[in-house]
Interface confidence: medium
């Protein structure tokens, strides 16, 4: 006897009624007196419902099952399961016996949608940039277990420092709590998405945190107004200071240095101790001066990539912050001068004079002059190319028609160091070769 059930699991929401479909093909002259129909749990063989000896024997399953008695004679052996519970999930077998015998199993997949997540923040008062907060996303009474994803305000995933727990209640429904631990930037949106994998239902919540700016009357943090200029390869001190009150101890101090734009942690001192460098192990605090209010940061072996703004956050009871700019610089080498063509030169010839200076930073300003100090601006092409370290090589080309004689000089200026490097070439009216032969 062929017994037919759906291949896919029957998905039923908790608390609703589900129909476990089962059918057979009755032969002509079939009567219900000939039918034995038994529904049982596939794994445990526990009886759920039966129809034998021409009548409905009723539910053996918490009085929550029923047959479609008016459709039975047409071969509809489906079972109605009322007020579905999580515990009902599993496989049910439909046995049909007339003269022959057949059976098939149908799966019941129970589901319950998760509630819209509620978002909580701890701490939730007087938040400042640099504070560590925990954001909790809670969603309730769903089934089966959820998948939880966190994102920032641009859709980028937040995977680090997330702890998710799921706890079943007495009905077997899950409450999900996902905790994100994050260091606050200037402001930010944090969102969590709770997915029910069976219902493919998404519930999401988000929270936007705008930390307060330092109020007046809080810790006054002092940094230099002008950028700190540091040569590539040397050490730089980013000065920062605060005024400790009488009785101040380092146990009260939270000091955080971070990159102003990206909020990347650079160095911190919290819980009474130096937490070390989070920036390529090239930073250090002046620990012996900290108690006197010197929160300066030492940055070693300065690189071009270090250039930018660093923020010094100081929190004792109150809070204050200030940003200091680091301007990186490297002096340009003395320019080398080349001439093309460089043989048998005569007045009226057109030549190109190239002035090359190397490994400076930032980009140079290049000026050309004649022997009388008059600027040569026409027909100059200057290119500057950064190497892997970010240092620039500058090549400036002057195209000129030779006079009877003349001096051509180029000046390469570093605008930050206000350092000038210059080179010159003198061309006489006689037929000559450059550089002059000994």
């Amino acid at each position: 006897l062929e017994v037919q059930v759906p291949e896919d699991p029957v998905v039923a929401l908790v608390g609703t009624d589900a129909t476990l479909r089962c059918s057979f093909s009755p032969e002509p002259g079939f009567s219900l007196a000939q039918l034995n129909l038994i529904w049982q749990l596939t794994d445990t063989k526990q009886l759920v419902h039966s129809f034998t000896e021409g009548r409905d024997q009723g539910s053996a399953y918490a009085n929550r099952t029923a047959l479609f008695l008016d459709l039975l004679a047409q071969g509809n052996a489906s079972l109605r399961l009322q007020r579905v519970r999580v515990a009902d999930e599993g496989s049910f077998t439909c046995f049909v016996s007339i003269r022959d015998f057949g059976s098939a199993a149908v799966s019941l997949q129970v589901a319950a949608p998760y509630s819209k997540p509620s978002m909580t923040l701890e701490p939730n008062k007087d938040l400042r940039p640099g504070d560590t907060v925990t954001i909790t996303c809670s969603s309730y009474r769903g089934y089966p277990e959820a998948e939880v994803f966190w994102q920032d305000g641009q859709g980028a995933p937040l995977t680090g420092n997330v702890t998710t727990s799921q706890m079943a209640n007495e009905q077997g429904l899950f409450d999900v709590h996902s905790v994100l631990r994050v260091v606050l930037g200037a402001n930010g949106t944090y969102s969590c998405l709770v997915r029910n994998p069976v219902l493919q239902q998404d519930a999401h919540g988000s929270i936007t945190i705008t930390p307060q700016r330092s109020p007046t009357g809080a810790v006054e943090v002092q940094v230099p107004e002008d950028p700190v200029v540091a040569l590539v390869g040397t050490d730089a001190t980013l000065r920062c200071s605060f005024s400790p009150e009488p009785g101040f101890s380092l146990a009260q101090l939270n000091l955080i240095w971070q990159l102003t734009d990206t909020k990347q942690l650079v160095h911190s001192f919290t819980e009474g101790r130096d937490q070390g460098s989070a920036y390529a192990n090239r930073t250090a605090l002046f620990l012996d001066l900290l108690a006197q209010g010197n929160a300066s940061l030492r940055l070693q072996r300065v690189r071009v990539a270090d250039e930018g703004s660093f923020t010094c956050f100081v929190s004792i009871r109150d809070f204050g912050s200030a940003a200091v700019s680091l301007q990186v610089a490297a002096p340009y080498s003395k320019p080398s001068m080349t001439l093309e063509p460089n043989k048998d030169l005569r007045p009226g010839d057109t030549v190109t004079i190239t002035c090359s200076s190397y490994r400076g930073y930032p980009e140079a300003e290049v000026f050309w002059q004649d022997g009388q100090g008059a600027p040569l601006t026409g027909n100059v092409t200057t290119s500057q190319m950064a190497n892997e370290q970010g240092l620039f090589d500058v090549h400036s080309v002057l195209r000129v028609v030779l006079g009877a004689n003349g001096t051509y000089s180029c000046l390469v200026r570093n605008p930050v160091l206000q350092q000038d490097a210059h080179g010159s070439v003198t061309i006489t009216g006689q037929p000559m070769t450059f550089p002059p032969e000994a």
Partner: antibody
Framework: EVQLVQSGAEVKKPGSSVKVSCKAS????????IHWVRQAPGQGLEWMGY????????DYNQKFKDRVTITADKSTSTAYMELSSLRSEDTAVYYC??????????????WGQGTTVTVSS | EIVLTQSPDFQSVTPKEKVTITCRAS?????MNWYQQKPDQSPKLLIK???NLASGVPSRFSGSGSGTDFTLTINSLEAEDAATYYC?????????FGQGTKLEIK
């Protein structure tokens, strides 16, 4: 019309660098992140990294982290991708794309026309 | 890194056929986007957030799935659908694409 227009094709020598530009128009440049995706000849799409033009925050695929720099100029609504120490396997079409949507669903809705970079000695 | 594996890599189909492309993630993702790329063109958004049709995309395209298994379906294929199709996730870094499925029209 929302558009991303990229700079023209480049031929580069191994060991050199290339800088590709992507000019945005028709929308607020600082409101969306710009991502860079490359496609080697006959191959699939490979994400390189992105920039938030407003905050200038960047994030890179670890595979390119030491060689790629993505920048943005708010004044000209232009994003740049610079790839250094070029090798022959960097020969590809480089695309910029706008990452759009809203919490929690995001997607690339606008793509540049692509810039072909050929690395050959 | 979440690896996205598409199947098949290549399929040759006749117009009006139904086509199913699958994308399997090496670990669970929050949603999947799908893109269509025709020869010598930039990719174009097709399906966003697993099942939502992008603007201007014909209704014969649909998407479904969750967790690690996602599907792009094209009902009643048309000649203009000859292209390479990519799935994409960014539930964890780095953002990744599937290797692509090339559809050829017989």
């Amino acid at each position: 019309e929302v558009q991303l227009v990229q700079s023209g094709a480049e031929v580069k020598k191994p060991g050199s660098s290339v800088k590709v530009s992507c000019k945005a128009s028709g929308y607020s440049f600082t409101s969306y992140t710009i991502h860079w995706v490359r496609q080697a000849p006959g191959q699939g799409l490979e994400w390189m990294g992105y920039i938030n033009p407003n905050s200038r925050n960047t994030d890179y695929n670890q595979k390119f982290k030491d060689r790629v720099t993505i920048t943005a100029d708010k004044s000209t609504s232009t994003a740049y991708m610079e790839l250094s120490s070029l090798r022959s396997e960097d020969t590809a079409v480089y695309y910029c794309a706008r990452y759009s949507g809203s919490t929690p669903y995001w997607y690339f809705d606008v793509w540049g026309q692509g810039t072909t970079v050929t690395v050959s000695s | 890194e979440i690896v996205l594996t598409q199947s098949p890599d290549f399929q040759s189909v006749t117009p009006k056929e139904k086509v199913t492309i699958t994308c399997r993630a090496s670990s669970s993702v929050s949603y999947m986007n799908w893109y269509q790329q025709k020869p010598d063109q930039s990719p174009k958004l097709l399906i966003k957030a697993t099942s939502n049709l992008a603007s201007g995309v014909p209704s014969r395209f649909s998407g479904s799935g969750s967790g690690t298994d996602f599907t792009l379906t094209i009902n009643s294929l048309e000649a203009e659908d000859a292209a390479t199709y990519y799935c994409q996730q960014w539930s964890s870094n780095p953002l990744t694409f599937g290797q692509g499925t090339k559809l050829e029209i017989k």
